[in-house]
Amino acid sequence: SQVSQNCHNGSYEISVLMMGNSAFAEPLKNLEDAVNEGLEIVRGRLQNAGLNVTVNATFMYSDGLIHNSGDCRSSTCEGLDLLRKISNAQRMGCVLIGPSCTYSTFQMYLDTELSYPMISAGSFGLSCDYKETLTRLMSPARKLMYFLVNFWKTNDLPFKTYSWSTSYVYKNGTETEDCFWYLNALEASVSYFSHELGFKVVLRQDKEFQDILMDHNRKSNVIIMCGGPEFLYKLKGDRAVAEDIVIILVDLFNDQYFEDNVTAPDYMKNVLVLTLSPGNSLLNSSFSRNLSPTKRDFALAYLNGILLFGHMLKIFLENGENITTPKFAHAFRNLTFEGYDGPVTLDDWGDVDSTMVLLYTSVDTKKYKVLLTYDTHVNKTYPVDMSPTFTWKNSKLPNDITGRGPQ
């Protein structure tokens, strides 16, 4: 039902859902800190623009008695329970930040009259695509899928002269929330990825994966998986790998590859790592940067959600427009705003755009090097290292089907 919003007369409130079931196991007070840092910045920006208004956040915690798995499995009802709590307290803000689980976001979107914007740090699944009042500030599965199709089709680069049309996907059900939905999208028979590939098989058992590595009768040389290097090592160990195998390791929210003094372990030589660019600067084929402590993408998305709200609030107030309208609810898309680490671009459907980076292990230096970058906004690949020192024959990626191209 419709809830009155605390969103007028110069006072604007943000409702922040602090759910026990979350896409990432981030300490909740840390997310509060991120929100409060964002509020400080927003207040400063509004003040600089001559807008004398109050912006606050209300943190809505669930009791955690029923929905206490800690991950996203029991999140479907938790989101609705929190909305009910907001409704009963008549404490809805101008915007809802949270939930991060695909299940809860989908259900909340389905079961409520969304006349207010919802900003999510997560909600990676395809079921949260194309939602009119939902904004997602972490790369959703659709973006990954478009990169993979683009890369598979590419055949005009010095290091990739074959189009690919096949793939194995390793998915064993123990994945983190982001990986679960990324792989789910690749597995779905109706997805863009499946539609564009001629052959795709999901490997669900460790042994299936391990057998493929040296199977002469394999149907594809390419295996997609999601997780970090340690996850791959647990699975692959020091097993021998056929020389034309290419493992694509999707590890978007991990910037350890960009640390100084990081050496790629030997088991990564057959692997291309897909991760997000660590900053807005153009990446060279080698890099170093000051890393922010720990993986902070989730907290950063919360903070950027606050900055996005501040950006929209500023625009609407400067134009003398009402905040509690469908126009405001639908406005959080097709724009660029000043995020914490630089400009953040949202596409026509309110999903964050980013620069994805494909890394390889140099056989010379044992360092991770940038092979290419991909701009999700324009769906375009930009080669970076034109003569990579690959492990693969002739320093070129093999064909995806054994028996054709370099073996």
Epitope: P27, K29, N30, E37, P293
Partner: antibody, heavy 120, light 108 residues
Framework: EVQLQQSGPELVRPGASVKISCTAS????????MSWVKQSHGKSPEWIGD????????SDNQKFKGKATLTVDKSSSTAYMEYRSLTSEDSAVYYC?????????????WGTGTTVTVSS | EILLTQSPTTMAASPGEKITITCSAS???????LHWYQEKPGFSPKLLIY???NLASGVPARFSGSGSGTSYSLTIGSMEAEDVATYYC?????????FGAGTKLELK
């Protein structure tokens, strides 16, 4: 009252290991990151690393990689740091500290400190 | 690694005197990531100022902080005997988190 109570002083032989504990009270340990800091006598503090008590994920200072192992026991609200292959250079006061800011960027509560003396 | 250089290393001040301690970073950092601590002999360090200018809970208003980029400062508006301590700046912008070498403040 929010407190971080650390285990008592340790006198250890070179080459040995030590495991320091830090028990949190007055707050829920999983709500914040926990960092560990080394302070040698007369020197400035050095950040060793931090741990997310929810999943045990750690971030560390390369200088202490392989030297310090951070763990958390959520049931007892206790964080631990195991420090290996001790030398005289490791004689110092070790603090646990509660991380604040966007992903543990400063420390608002410090532990009582544990003095470790390495001597043969 | 971001290096923080504090100055002066030691200083003595009379009660009522205004004190300024500076902290210079080897590369530019966001003001959200610079913090100050006070350490009295025999005690654990205590958070004084976070995010450049925010006073931590229970810290007297005579303490203030400012700065941006590579240059930051801590000011004590009017020195008191209880302010005798060593003061450290700390950055949270890059791994590893690092502290300045400290400024020892004594009573004249």
């Amino acid at each position: 009252e929010v407190q971080l109570q650390q285990s008592g002083p340790e006198l250890v032989r070179p080459g040995a290991s030590v495991k320091i504990s830090c028990t949190a009270s007055g707050y829920t340990i999983t709500d914040y990151y926990m960092s560990w800091v080394k302070q040698s006598h007369g020197k400035s503090p050095e950040w060793i690393g931090d741990i997310n008590p929810n999943n045990g994920g750690t971030s560390d200072n390369q200088k202490f990689k392989g030297k310090a192992t951070l763990t958390v026991d959520k049931s007892s609200s206790t964080a631990y740091m195991e420090y290996r292959s001790l030398t005289s250079e490791d004689s110092a006061v070790y603090y646990c500290a509660r991380g604040r800011g966007m992903v543990a960027r400063y420390f608002d509560i410090w532990g009582t400190g544990t003095t470790v003396t390495v001597s043969s | 690694e971001i290096l923080l250089t504090q100055s002066p290393t030691t200083m003595a001040a009379s009660p009522g005197e205004k004190i300024t301690i500076t902290c210079s970073a080897s590369s530019s950092i966001s003001s959200n990531f610079l913090h100050w601590y006070q350490e009295k002999p025999g005690f654990s360090p205590k958070l004084l100022i976070y995010r450049t200018s925010n006073l931590a809970s229970g810290v007297p208003a005579r303490f203030s902080g400012s700065g941006s980029g590579t240059s930051y400062s801590l000011t004590i508006g009017s020195m008191e005997a209880e302010d005798v301590a060593t003061y450290y700046c700390q950055q949270g912008s890059g791994l590893p988190l690092t502290f300045g070498a400290g400024t020892k403040l004594e009573l004249k």
